[in-house]
Interface confidence: low
């Protein structure tokens, strides 16, 4: 038991400390008082605290706790924030390069297709970017639209260059024929599979990182309960009321208080562990057709192969399409 | 095969590499992130202990405060919480998490389920044919030799893959703040909360 304060004891030390905490306020007793109105720092004898001081201590204790929590999560928070930003930018760079590679392939191999091809390729990769960022676009529709748009240009510029390229009638017929006749063989299906799988995984990876940020932000900005505030005040500040300015809380006592204050937060632990391990599993599986870097940067080659496939079947296709779209062509020549 | 479009449309600045010791791909980046994240796997269970170790606690002193009185650091009284007749620590724990914490737990459950679904190896075996062969038979018209297949990865491998460090403005080993200029640069310094209280400890 600490000895009771000597009769000449004043609250000078407590006063000067409290003044720094709350400048200009005269809430500190000159000399120790009974403190019968105190609700948190219940005195065993005369005390240098008043009810107002107690309130200020509670406020400060909760603020300290919030700051300590933010300090604790700072490194983790920046790790995830930063990676989310880096990966988002990196994915955009992959998309940009994939578009550039595809455009370069058209420019070098099929210069006559370039103006329109560039446009269709650009639209396709814009959709890819939007999908990664969470847009509600269907990947199969994106791929179909790319090939539907490309085929009329390939037909009019490469397979049948004598046709005028201005009329829309034949274009609509050619778009339909593209699917009915499987003009590009199985390449569109191959691209759909690869692109949809790699983009799906990429999208969920980014979603998971963004949720990680949300988790940390949530716990970072928790407001602690009044009960917790009282416990923290007793631990950190009630000793001051007895003039014990230099004494620190016992370690075991601190752990008990913190476990009480953070009981709710600690419940996240199980799901947080599972989150990291599930994310690890996802990352370990992000290769081959599940790796968008691999898939998108090779798309130019697959698209080139698909056009070569059309070229190799051009004779048969021209005859079939000539019959199929004859009505549209006649209307054009009139 | 297609004319390899190297250098044609790629910004020249991409190729200016700052201190990259090896070819960095996104996959190595992802693995690096997971390794770093795994060091935080016990983050939430360790929080109470972390906060105690980063706030003033008696370490070398003989005496310490137990909420009611000054006691010897290793005595029975030191671990007592000094809260009897005030508010029950057990009650505080029984209240359960705040609604905002419950919400975030639900979101975590949902994303964990999604992540597990996406990682399911069973689902992948079914795709393997498409991935490796590229085509089902009979899909290529009359001449089977016209089938241009997606062997291996179903595509030509792009040389070196991208050296992403060269393009990105920041590298995770030499990282600056997130894209948001409002944010501070990362560091894990303890915010000196108690310094605000007049350096009493």
């Amino acid at each position: 038991q600490p000895p009771p304060p000597p009769p000449d004891a004043t609250c000078h030390q407590v006063r000067s400390f409290f003044q720094r905490l709350q400048p200009g306020l005269k809430w500190v007793p000159e000399t120790p008082v009974p403190g019968s109105d105190l609700q948190v720092c219940l005195p065993k004898g005369p005390t240098c605290c008043s009810r107002k001081m107690e309130e200020k201590y509670q406020l400060t204790a909760r603020l300290n706790m919030e700051q300590l929590l933010q300090s604790a999560s700072m490194e983790l928070k920046f790790l995830i924030i930063q990676n989310a930003a880096v990966f988002q930018e990196a994915f955009e760079i992959v998309v940009r390069h994939a578009k550039n590679y595809t455009n370069a392939m058209f420019k070098n191999n099929y210069p006559s297709l370039t103006p329109q091809a560039f446009e269709f390729v650009g639209e396709f990769f814009t959709d890819v970017s939007l999908y990664i960022l969470g847009s509600d676009i269907n990947v199969d529709d994106m791929v179909n639209e790319l090939f539907d748009s490309l085929f009329p240009v390939i037909y009019t510029q490469l397979m049948n260059p004598g046709l005028p390229d201005s009329a829309l009638d034949i274009n609509e017929c050619l778009r339909g024929a593209r699917r009915d006749l499987k003009v590009f063989g199985n390449f569109p299906k191959l691209i759909m599979t690869q692109v949809s799988k790699s983009l799906q995984v990429t999208r969920i990876f980014l979603q998971a990182l963004n949720l990680g940020i949300e988790v940390i932000n949530t716990t970072d900005h928790l407001k602690f309960s009044k009960d917790c505030g009282r416990m923290l005040t007793r631990m950190w500040y009630c000793s001051y009321c007895q003039g014990l300015m230099m004494v620190k809380p016992c370690g075991g006592y601190c752990n008990v208080v913190m476990q009480g204050c953070m009981a709710g937060v600690v419940e996240i632990d199980k799901y947080w562990r599972e989150y990291i391990l599930s994310l690890e599993e996802l990352v370990n599986g992000m290769y081959r057709i599940y790796d968008m870097e691999n898939v998108l940067l090779g798309l130019f080659s697959t698209i080139h192969d698909s056009i070569q496939y059309v070229q190799k079947n051009a004779g048969k296709l021209t005859t079939t399409i000539g019959k199929l779209c004859a009505h549209s062509q006649q209307r054009q020549y009139r | 095969s297609a004319y390899y479009p190297e250098d044609l449309f790629i910004d020249k600045k991409v190729l200016k590499v700052a201190h990259v010791e090896h070819e960095e791909t996104l996959s190595s980046r992802r693995r690096e992130l997971i390794q770093k994240l795994k060091s935080f796997i016990s983050f939430y269970s360790a929080l109470p202990g972390y906060i105690c170790s980063h706030s003033p606690v008696a370490e070398n002193d003989t005496l310490c405060w137990n909420g009611q009185e000054l006691v010897e650091r290793y005595s029975q009284k030191a671990a007592r919480n000094g809260m009897k007749n005030q508010f029950n620590l057990h009650e505080l724990k029984m209240k359960g998490p705040e609604p905002v914490v419950s919400q975030i737990i639900d979101k975590l459950k949902h994303i964990n389920q999604l992540l597990r679904t996406m990682s399911m190896p069973k689902g992948r075996v079914l795709d393997k044919n498409l991935d490796e062969e590229g085509f089902e038979s009979g899909d290529c018209g009359d001449d089977e030799d016209e089938c241009i297949g997606g062997s291996g990865d179903g595509m030509i491998k792009v040389k070196n893959q991208l050296r992403f460090l060269a393009e990105l403005a920041y590298d995770l080993d030499v990282d600056d703040a997130p894209g948001n200029s409002q944010q501070a640069t990362p560091k894990d310094n303890e915010i000196s909360t108690f310094h605000n209280l007049g350096n009493v400890h």
């Epitope: - | 080993d173 703040a177 200029s181 640069t185 894990d188």
Partner: antibody
């Protein structure tokens, strides 16, 4: 009194190694990130390296990456800089500096510096 | 890397003068800029951080302003102890970089 004291400087040949130490006192060393900054004779300041309080996050300037290693021992209140493959251009006064504890970074406490001379 | 360019590099002034030093960043650094003072043979001393926040113990004649890419350090009434070299530093992104310095000499 808050203080940082560097030691370990001296004359070393190109290609050689040196280990600098920085002893901290008067503050909770384990709660602060720490930096090394150097200043070549008659020149300006150049940031060299940073370590977070837990050593989980470490950064280097391009000019020293792969040659210098920053480390710390929180139990000993000490910061270190292991310098290998030293070059003439590494000749400088090396300061250790504390990273401020607030939201915004700044080097609020500096040591007096230790001179490193690389010469054959 | 972000380059910081201070101007002027040398400045001659008299006691009581108002002095302004400019620091330009090669790209936007928001408000992540600090100013240091270094006397010959001594370690640098932090004057201002976060563009305009005065470090405790630094006289109020020192002030900082700016944002983005253009920043200034102002000494309203130069005192004898202010003759020194001043450096700006960006802390927006790694590697952290310093300006080349501005030497304030007695006229």
């Amino acid at each position: 009194e808050v203080q940082l004291v560097e030691s370990g400087g001296g004359l070393v040949q190109p290609g050689g190694s040196l280990r600098l130490s920085c002893a901290a006192s008067g503050f909770t060393f384990s709660g602060f990130g720490m930096n090394w900054v150097r200043q070549a004779p008659g020149k300006g300041l150049e940031w060299v390296s940073y370590t977070s309080s837990s050593s989980r996050t470490i950064y280097y300037a391009d000019s020293v990456k792969g040659r210098f290693t920053i480390s710390r021992d929180n139990a000993q209140n000490s910061l270190y800089l292991q310098m290998n493959s030293l070059r003439d251009e590494d000749t400088a006064v090396y300061y250790c500096a504390r990273d401020s504890s607030g939201w915004y970074d700044a080097f609020d406490i500096w040591g007096q510096g230790t001179m490193v001379t690389v010469s054959s | 890397d972000i380059q910081l360019t201070q101007s002027p590099s040398f400045l001659s002034a008299s006691v009581g003068d108002r002095v302004t030093i400019t620091c330009r960043a090669s790209q936007d650094i928001s408000s992540y800029l600090a100013w240091y003072q270094q006397e010959p043979g001594k370690a640098p001393k932090l004057l201002i951080y976060a563009t305009s926040t005065l470090q405790s113990g630094v006289p109020s004649r020192f002030s900082g302003s700016g944002s983005g890419t253009e920043f200034t350090l102002t000494i309203t009434s130069l005192q004898p102890e202010d003759f020194a070299t001043y450096y700006c530093q960006q802390l927006n992104s790694y590697p952290w970089t310093f300006g080349q310095g501005t030497k304030v000499e007695i006229k």
